[in-house]
Interface confidence: low
């Protein structure tokens, strides 16, 4: 008959993936067909993988995903010709431990942390066998860094200053497969270094080929000599500078730029050590070139008083204005209205005042520091009759 | 039939990173885990981690945290084993081992770390 | 982590005699065991896993067994190619852990 060997009574699991394993030996040896498995609500398991050597079958069955619910006696069954073989087993299936509360920040500096870590209570089962600190930058596209823990009090160091750093932890039980899934996360902020930036920047275009940055005076906390250091890099190309402007100024021209190109700009404040950098900002420089005509010119919601006109414009042609002209069709050039929208940010404008059952001829240009640009085609608006008062 | 092949050697200086390479064919590369696996001149083996190509889960032993990044390349059928600021005591043979049960290895890369 | 102690560390024997090499696991490891042979030039092969089922293509002269805590690999009559290094390596709790080694000389 053939013998099941090497099975323990107990087994204790985690769920998730089990590829538990039935071994028998035998004349003639049990072949893959005459091996299976069958869990506690009678459901039969074929086996995934089956090997051989002189003395025994080995059959390797795949649970994709065991959970609590599988807990229970488990039978492993051999059926040869030379007869039935079975040999119960327990298998306890265990929860993946997973923290209930976030790890709580108690210290930070511009390069460190002290956490407590929080690990209970937890959800699911012990014993914890090791404990990690998942840590990670905010915006920052990296894997998440871990550290093993054995206290409940843990600091991390060498961290970025002034950076959001994202923590939690993952519980690890015994056993294949024993990490739980991470907890819940907390977020903190690491501490600035050196002086905080300038305050009151603004980066405005002056000319075709330079930008003006300002900002507010600079009154320093002690003696130490300072400077402000600006570094401007272009958008579209690879092209950066940085420049050093004494302490006592409060703006700086950037020049030997590009016409109608954009420029990020930020700036700091050094003593012997680096001050933190400010936000980046960003402008063009004036265009060389009239501006391209407002793209996705449309009109709508047509009354016999009234009509929207919207518009779509393509940035980096410093343009300053909208100009919507519009006159009745048929009359004089000379009898025509001008719209002047002075926020080139605005994309749409209400024309009112309209005469009903009138048509019009709609223009729309753009203008920049070299001058208007040139409409393509003229738009027809047709008014509606005026509704009859009851 | 499987087959994971690597670079026979890598010279590299003292601190400069290194990025040593395990091509992997004959087998559904996503489906198993890759091991690496380092051995010092006449000492025996050390597990380094292993990551599956699936979704790049990494496990590392504690022992190599700071030093081992493993990263994987689906549509090469390609493991990378990044070693930061080497040192004398990182030069040694790295092997590469495929699945949980290290059923093929690689040739081994011979990594000499000097100036 | 799980230590995995290696014996004897060298083996001097003659060909055609029966030799065993033993892994003995710190934890309780189940079947989760291989054993490989390292070559000369470094080529590594694993030779049987779950600790004894035999890979395929290799020779019926090598076993592997289990006697508690102990595992042992057995080569039944050595032949030349068989004086190389083995290992053993655990896969039943993560970090992996190999044996020391056993170099298998000829006498």
């Known amino acids: 008959t053939p013998k099941i060997v090497d099975l323990p009574d107990h087994i204790e699991v985690n769920s998730g993936k089990f590829n538990p394993i039935c071994k028998a030996s035998g004349w003639p040896l049990p072949t893959n067909e005459e091996m299976t498995l069958v869990k506690p609500d009678g459901t039969v398991l074929h086996p995934k993988d089956f090997n051989h050597t002189d003395h025994f079958s080995v059959a390797i069955f795949t649970i994709h995903r065991i959970l609590p619910p599988d807990s229970g006696v488990w039978v492993c069954s051999v059926n040869t010709v030379a007869g039935m073989v079975e040999k119960p087993f327990n298998i306890s299936v265990k929860v993946l431990p997973k923290p209930l509360n976030a790890p709580n920040v108690i210290d930070t500096g511009h390069n460190f942390a002290v956490i407590n870590i929080s690990s209970e209570p937890y959800f699911g089962d012990g014993p914890i066998k090791s404990k990690k600190l998942l840590y990670k930058p905010v915006n920052h596209y990296e894997a998440w860094q871990h550290i093993q823990v054995t206290n409940e009090i843990v600091t991390l160091n060498y961290l970025e200053p002034r950076t959001e750093y994202e923590l939690c932890v993952q519980l690890v039980r015994r056993g294949e497969g024993g990490e739980g899934h991470p907890g819940p996360v907390r977020r903190f902020t690491t501490a600035s270094i050196g002086l905080p930036p300038p305050r009151g920047l603004n980066l405005l275009p002056k000319s075709q080929t330079t930008l003006n940055l300002t900002w507010q005076p600079i009154f320093p906390s002690s003696e130490d000599d300072f400077y402000v250091e600006v570094e401007r890099r272009s958008v579209q190309k690879s092209d950066q500078q940085n420049i050093k402007v004494p302490g006592n100024l409060t703006s700086v021209l950037l020049n030997n730029l590009h016409p109608r190109e954009q420029y990020v700009v930020r700036a700091r404040v050094n003593t012997k050590a680096q001050g933190e950098w400010s936000e980046d900002l960003t402008a063009w420089t004036l265009s060389d070139i009239l501006p391209p005509q407002p793209e996705n010119i449309k009109i709508s919601n047509i009354t016999h008083s009234s009509a929207v006109i919207s518009w779509t414009i393509l940035d980096g042609y410093s343009i300053s204005s909208i100009t919507i002209r519009y006159k009745v069709q048929g009359k004089n050039e000379d009898q025509h209205v001008d719209v002047k929208i002075k926020n080139a940010t605005i994309t749409q404008y209400q024309l009112k005042g309209l005469e009903p059952e009138t048509a019009y001829q709609v223009d729309i240009f753009a203008e920049n520091n070299i001058g208007s640009s040139n409409p393509a085609f003229s738009h027809e608006l047709v008014t509606l009759p005026e509704s009859q008062a009851p | 039939q499987v087959q994971l092949q690597q670079p026979g050697a890598e010279l590299v200086r003292p601190g400069a990173s290194v990025k040593l390479s395990c091509k992997a064919s004959?087998?559904?590369?996503?489906?198993?885990?890759m091991n690496w696996v380092k051995q010092r001149p006449g000492q025996g083996l050390e597990w380094i981690g292993m990551?599956?190509?699936?979704?790049?889960?990494?496990r590392l032993n504690q022992k190599f945290k700071d030093k081992a990044t493993l990263t994987v390349d689906k549509s090469s059928s390609t493991a990378y084993l990044q070693l930061s600021s080497p040192t004398s005591e990182d030069s040694a043979v790295y092997y590469c081992?495929?699945?949980?049960?290290?059923?093929?290895w690689g040739q081994g890369t011979t990594l000499t770390v000097s100036s | 982590d799980i230590q995995m102690t290696q014996s004897p560390s060298s083996l001097s024997a003659s060909l055609g005699e029966r030799v065993s090499l033993t892994c003995r696991a710190s934890?309780?490891?189940?079947?989760?065991l291989n054993w490989l042979q390292q070559e000369p030039d470094g080529t590594i092969k694993r030779l049987i896993y779950?600790?004894?089922i035999l890979d395929s293509g290799v020779p019926k002269r090598f076993s592997g067994s289990r006697s508690g805590s102990d595992y042992s690999l057995t080569i039944s009559s050595l032949e030349s190619e068989d004086f190389v290094d083995y290992y053993c390596?655990?896969?039943?709790?993560?970090?992996?852990?190999f044996g020391g080694g056993t170099k298998l000389e000829i006498k």
């Open positions: 081992a495929r699945g949980n049960y290290f059923d093929c």
């Open positions: 779950a600790t004894s």
């Open positions: 934890q309780d490891i189940g079947i989760s």
């Open positions: 004959g087998y559904s590369f996503t489906s198993y885990w």
């Open positions: 990551i599956h190509p699936s979704d790049s889960e990494t």
């Open positions: 390596l655990q896969y039943a709790s993560s970090p992996w852990t």
